[in-house]
Interface confidence: medium
């Protein structure tokens, strides 16, 4: 089951997957001035059996005479209409990734591929967040997000990460010492819920993890 939307955006942070669940698709995108070869695949697909997972199909780009070739020329299949974009990541991965059953490694780059990779994640996929250079991570909990299915709908859990403008960068898992984080609801977010009767009140308040505001009115 494909995830319907993108992983959450965290100000001054980027995300990446350490491994990709079987069923994940990666668009075959080419950089400007290049396009997919005519008979080439639209996407790579992470497939596998109980013992081994790998990417099916290969992406191939060829020189293009036309200029507007940043995006695929062929329309994407309907189930691929939601796009998950991540920056190009280094193929270097934590050593334990290959042993994760049912997952594929980051596919190696192909010649003339686009600078951004567009993934189509599946339920159960986990992505990890880090603050961009120049920002420091404040962790309230795990700096990760998981695509979950709830009553037939998919959504991403909210990573408990805040990036502040101090000159110290956090690292991705496998590159940092593990941080203890308070156990809490896995998909909690800073949220507001205010209830009023008769009329609606717009309330500005500093929301904490426990703060809720649902505004209720009647007509």
């Amino acid at each position: 089951e494909l995830c319907d939307d993108d992983p959450p955006e965290i100000p001054h942070a980027t995300f990446k997957a350490m491994a990709y669940k079987e069923g994940t698709m990666l668009n075959c995108e080419c950089k400007r001035g290049f396009r997919r070869i005519k008979s080439g695949s639209l996407y790579m697909l992470c497939t596998g059996n109980s013992s081994h997972s790998s990417w099916d199909n290969q992406c191939q780009c060829t020189s293009s005479a036309t200029r507007n070739t940043t995006k695929q020329v062929t329309p994407q299949p309907e189930e691929q209409k939601e796009r998950k974009t991540t920056e190009m990541q280094s193929p270097m991965q934590p050593v334990d990734q290959a042993s994760l059953p049912g997952h594929c490694r980051e596919p190696p780059p192909w010649e003339n591929e686009a600078t951004e990779r567009i993934y189509h994640f599946v339920v159960g996929q986990m992505v990890y967040y880090q603050c961009v250079q120049g920002y420091r991570a404040l962790h309230r909990g795990p700096a990760e997000s998981v695509c979950k299915m709830t009553h037939g709908k998919t959504r991403w859990t909210q990573p408990q990460l805040i990036c502040t403008g101090e000159m110290e960068t956090s690292q991705f898992p496998g590159e940092e010492k593990p941080q203890a984080s308070p156990e809490g609801r896995p998909e909690s977010e800073t949220s507001c819920l205010v209830t009023t009767t008769d009329f609606q009140i717009q309330t500005e308040m500093a929301a904490t993890m426990e703060t809720s505001i649902f505004t209720t009115e009647y007509q």
Epitope: D5, T150, H151, R155, W156, E189, L193, I213, F214
Partner: antibody, heavy 104, light 106 residues
């Protein structure tokens, strides 16, 4: 009694469209009763059998608001009504409630 | 079914609240809430034993099958409230709350 009523629940601070929102009734001095849930993104709605046909749950995703509506109130509808965010198998954030009193 | 209906204890004591389901419930689908007078319920425990954000570690949940327990290891004055267990059923989709246990100061 007999009047219509629509109460609303405005959410902020999280991705409203990707969480189910539930409604829970609490009659005076009594316990909690689940009424139903709605998925604001596409207005998919599920009702408790006890409340099916008695109330209508709706949502307007453009203004992050869910609604609970009665077409004809009864005295037995007098209760506190809570909206709550559905965390999956439990409700992890609650509004402070709207008290509905039906009297002649 | 929650028992007892009312539990009278003193601050510092240990409280044990019981929740019994009519049929077996997956541990993933059992939650506990606290409600104080004039306030909305608050999630304490989900997945039988996982504490929600900001819940002190004196609250713990356990159990399996049809019998589940909420334990408050050492009662604080602010813990006196009504506690509800809640189970989830996926087909048909249904959230069922227990009738509540009132925890009062002895």
């Amino acid at each position: 009694p007999g009047e219509s009523l629509k109460i609303s629940c405005k959410s902020s601070g999280y991705s409203f469209n990707t969480y189910w929102i539930g409604w829970v009734r609490q009659m005076p001095g009594k316990g909690l009763e689940w009424m139903g849930i709605i998925y604001p993104s596409d207005s998919d709605t599920r009702y408790s059998p006890s409340f099916q046909g008695q109330v209508t749950i709706s949502a307007d995703k453009s203004i992050n608001t869910a609604y609970l509506q009665w077409s004809s109130l009864k005295a037995s509808d007098s209760a506190m009504y809570y909206c709550a965010r559905d965390g999956g198998y439990y409700f992890d954030d609650w509004g402070q409630g709207t008290l509905v009193t039906v009297s002649s | 079914t929650q028992s007892p209906g009312t539990l009278s204890l003193s601050p510092g004591e240990r409280a044990t609240l019981s929740c019994r389901a009519s049929q077996s419930v997956s541990s993933t689908y059992l939650a506990w809430y606290q409600q104080k007078p004039g306030q909305a319920p608050r999630l304490l425990i989900y997945g039988t034993s996982r504490r929600a954000t900001g819940i002190p570690d004196r609250f713990s949940g356990s159990g399996s099958g049809t019998d589940f327990t909420l334990t408050i290891s050492r009662l604080e004055p602010e813990d006196f409230a009504v506690y509800y267990c809640q189970q989830y059923n996926s087909s048909p989709l249904m959230y069922t709350f227990g009738q509540g246990t009132r925890l009062e100061i002895k």
